[in-house]
């Protein structure tokens, strides 16, 4: 289920799957929510530790049991991923952090009159992931009112420093507030060039596009279909970026599909989950559990309820069935995508709906002069 | 909202505008989306007005002037007014609206979390009131959704300021000693939300006050935590499964 409570002065021991710098526990929790394997997190605010390297440290953790031992650590904040938390799942993070400089690659500097305007500029720049703004009272006069637009390889700051009269924050593109707009078109038989930032296996171009949308550095993608001439590249989804923000070239290519991230869409973003079920397809991955269930939809529900499950295969092979129930293979991988996609099998595959934000957890777990 | 500022898109995605279309159409109250098909508001919003037919509920909007005849709206399937609410009394000023069709959640339209039942231990220090109501006592409905940061006031302090009225444990008050920032007419039914541990919770429903933003006259809100049993009971679906779960 959904667990929203935070544990003050507590740190989860072990289970690390990733670490990064984040300005607060809530942003750390959001990164945990969107990480394919993270179930728990621990965050070290600046006040909690003397080690400059670990200040603002966000540690993403996994556990086979879903829990880890807590150790007392003054100032630390720990908690759970919000996977399975329905409408609370959002990559949107509006907070502005005063007295904090989030470091990264500074690719644009301009003078603006307020931190809100700086955030707006970041939101309206295709490459900007976060920003820092030097206020009117910054100690160096020449830097006052400077708005620095930034990015980093992982989408989070490469370092976070306490610095007076500096305010930092993140792009509001995940809030569907970008003024850039987006390309909804999917281009059949076209391959985009430029830099690959990641490679995953997906059953179709739409899953590829959603993964691109929620990847911090993906601006566009090319997907190689299951009939692509090179067998080892079938169902490969290449997540891409470029200096300009658009593909520098595209090549006509049979059995490829290309498109753009939808992160810059105005007013509506795709859900960060994939609800379609793929008949005749087998998703390979690390086995989490095998259970007998009645029907593929129940298999998907079972996967969704088991928080570590990322995807599943429901087998209809006679040897995998007894009476009306068949085997439901619950699986996971390092990146949340299948490690192998096979066609022509007797069965169906699909993904966990744990990141769907339309879940029915409508409310969180945890007279005189009338107006 | 008196002394407030403009909100931005998606900042308060649970805020809805309850509008009435008799001869003309007008905004009357705020409300809070608490589920795909449920809105929580104040009972007094329905005083003197028909139930169901004439109401239009707009969600996922920021600027009332953007509403046209083509703007989608929700209609009411059922209005559940608290059984102990009495017109012109401040007590039990709470009502649930069941929408005719469930709403999809987006970044601009999603529910607010409800507090734990009888939540008394949490100390809320970051509370906001939002609405399209008057910006002064004899004002007019605002176009852009307004927001204002207001501190909670203890019930003891609030009772001192309202000696002619009974401030019950099922009410919560918010305001500045010096006044200047408050909810006002047209904000009724809307949310008083507080951010705690990074999560927004619906602490109050805008209900009443002496004038608006007057010195030493805090706003009085229906305390949502005190009505959790009622909310959960009324939002049970026909198959007995709760449409929403209260915090553990």
């Amino acid at each position: 289920g959904c667990l929203t409570q935070l544990y003050e002065n507590a740190f989860f021991r072990g289970g690390d799957v990733a670490s990064m710098y984040t300005p607060n526990a809530q942003y750390c929790q959001m990164r945990c929510t969107f990480h394919p394997r993270c179930l728990l997190f621990s965050f070290l605010p600046a006040s909690s530790i003397n080690d400059m390297e670990k200040r603002f440290g966000c540690f993403l953790k996994d556990s086979v049991t879903g829990t880890l031992p807590k150790v007392h650590r003054t100032g630390a904040v720990s908690g759970h991923s919000l996977k399975q938390c329905g409408h609370q799942i959002s990559a949107c993070h509006r907070d502005i952090y005063k007295g904090v400089d989030m470091r990264g690659v500074n690719f644009n500097v301009s003078k603006v009159s307020s931190v809100e305007e700086c955030q707006k500029r970041c939101t309206s720049n295709i490459r900007c992931q976060f920003f820092s703004y030097a206020t009117q009272t910054f100690h160096k006069a020449e830097y006052r009112n400077n708005c620095l637009l930034k990015y980093s390889p992982g989408g989070t700051p490469t370092a976070i420093k306490v610095l007076s009269n500096v305010e930092s924050g993140f792009s509001l593109k995940p809030c569907a507030l970008s003024e850039i707009g987006c390309h909804m078109n999917i281009f059949q038989h076209l391959a985009f060039s430029d830099v690959d930032v990641a490679r995953v296996l997906t059953p179709d171009a739409f899953v590829c596009r959603t993964i691109c949308t929620y990847h911090p550095n993906c601006l566009f993608f090319t997907f190689y279909t299951n009939v692509w001439k090179i067998e080892s590249q079938r169902n490969v989804c290449l997540l891409k970026t470029s200096e300009s923000g658009t593909p520098s070239s595209s090549t006509p290519q049979e059995n490829t599909i290309s498109g753009y991230s939808l992160l810059t869409c105005k007013r509506t973003l795709p859900e960060p989950c994939h609800s379609k079920i793929y008949p005749g397809v087998d998703f390979g991955g690390e086995e989490l559990n095998v259970t007998f269930v009645k029907g593929v939809n129940v298999c998907q529900e079972t996967c969704t309820k088991m928080i570590r499950c990322q995807f599943f295969t429901y087998s209809l092979l006679p040897e995998d069935c007894k009476e009306e129930k068949c085997k439901c293979f619950l699986r996971l991988s390092m990146d949340g995508s299948p490690t192998r996609i096979a066609y022509g099998t007797q069965g169906s595959s699909g993904y966990s709906l744990r990141l769907c934000n339309t879940g029915d957890n409508s409310v969180c777990t945890t007279k005189t002069s009338t107006r | 909202i008196v002394g407030g500022t403009n909100s931005s898109w998606g900042e308060w995605p649970w805020q809805v505008s309850l509008q009435v279309k008799l001869t003309a159409q007008r905004h009357l109250c705020g409300g809070s989306l608490i589920g795909h098909q449920w809105v929580l508001t104040a009972a007094h919003c329905f005083d003197g007005l028909p139930l169901q037919d004439v109401w239009r509920i707009y969600s996922g909007i920021l600027n009332l002037s953007d509403i046209t005849k083509d703007t989608p709206f929700s209609q009411i399937k059922e209005i559940i007014i608290h059984q102990n609410y009495k017109v012109s009394e401040g007590n039990h000023d709470i009502a649930l609206i069941k929408l005719q069709a469930p709403l999809n959640y987006t970044e601009f339209q999603k529910p607010i979390c409800l507090p734990s039942k009888g939540d008394t231990s949490t100390i809320y220090t970051n509370c906001w009131v939002t609405g399209w109501g008057f910006s002064k006592e004899k004002g007019e409905i605002q176009n852009i959704l307004q927001k204002v940061n207001i501190p909670l006031v203890t019930n003891e302090e609030c009772q001192k300021r309202y000696q002619d009225y009974k401030i019950t444990q099922r009410m919560v008050c918010a305001g500045y000693k010096e006044g200047g920032k408050d909810a006002c007419k047209g904000d009724s039914g809307g949310p008083l939300v507080c951010k705690h541990n990074g999560m927004w919770r619906l602490v109050g429903i805008t209900s009443w006050g002496e004038g608006c933003a007057r010195r030493e006259q805090p706003g009085v809100y229906t305390k949502v935590a005190e009505y959790m049993d009622w909310i959960l009971e009324k939002t049970q679906s026909s198959d007995g499964k709760a449409q929403m779960q209260s915090p553990a």
Epitope: - | L22, H44, D47, L51, S88
Partner: antibody
Framework: EVQLLESGGGLVQPGGSLRLSCAAS????????MVWVRQAPGKGLEWVSY????????FYADSVKGRFTISRDNSKNTLYLQMNSLRAEDTAVYYC???????????????WGQGTLVTVSS | QSALTQPPTVSVSPGQTARITCSGN??????VAWYQQKPGQSPMLVIY???KRPSAIPERFSGSNSANTATLSISGTQALDEADYYC?????????FGGGTRLTVL
């Protein structure tokens, strides 16, 4: 066009009863708060009672509380005033009016009937 | 249940501005409506929500309300404006009328 037509007035003895009716047309009756206002001969207007659109809430002036009952039948577009224990001081022209009411703007009556005379005398 | 007080009579010369007052405790906090009633006729709404005019009412009629007094003003008064005028307010479920003012156009 909004029309309100009162009926049921007449001469009645003190302590007697009378039922006034108000037939409404030209608007969606079930959407509006309805009100009775009276005017004694040569005197000013005095509010008597009003009723919410659904009939779920009713309000009375102190002078008639416990003696008069307001009601409505939305299927017949009709408003009623049942008057019991009538007194000489209840003698007046009784007007039925359509009320515009909400908690923001309060109450006012934008359409009035022609009135029906009630005389309480022995 | 506070009372609303109006002067019994107001006289005005044709073409002049007539001002009829209505006073009550904290009346400025409430919204006031004004009704015109000519002999033998039903009352007619001329001002609502302090200052608003129904579409059929001429612009000569205006209203204001602050502190403890609401005022109905009729500019360029004409003979046909001669009537009784009533103020009305709403307070905690109670409808309150003023005692009425007879406007005489001299």
């Amino acid at each position: 066009e909004v029309q309100l037509l009162e009926s049921g007035g007449g001469l009645v003895q003190p302590g007697g009863s009378l039922r006034l009716s108000c037939a409404a047309s030209g608007f969606t009756f079930s959407w509006y708060t309805m009100v009775w206002v009276r005017q004694a001969p040569g005197k000013g207007l005095e509010w008597v009672s009003y009723i919410y659109p659904s009939g779920g809430a009713t309000f009375y002036a102190d002078s008639v509380k416990g003696r008069f009952t307001i009601s409505r039948d939305n299927s017949k577009n009709t408003l009623y005033l049942q008057m019991n224990s009538l007194r000489a001081e209840d003698t007046a022209v009784y007007y039925c009016a359509m009320g515009s009411y909400d908690y923001i703007w309060g109450f006012y009556s934008d359409h009035w009937g022609q009135g029906t005379l009630v005389t309480v005398s022995s | 249940q506070s009372a609303l007080t109006q002067p019994p009579t107001v006289s005005v010369s044709p073409g002049q501005t007539a001002r009829i007052t209505c006073s009550g405790n904290k009346l400025g906090d409430k919204y006031v409506a004004w009704y015109q009633q000519k002999p033998g006729q039903s009352p007619m709404l001329v001002i609502y929500q302090d200052t608003k005019r129904p579409s059929a009412i001429p612009e000569r009629f205006s209203g204001s309300n602050s502190a403890n007094t609401a005022t109905l003003s009729i500019s360029g008064t004409q003979a046909l404006d001669e009537a009784d005028y009533y103020c009305q307010a709403w307070d905690s479920s109670i409808v309150i009328f003023g005692g009425g003012t007879r406007l005489t156009v001299l």
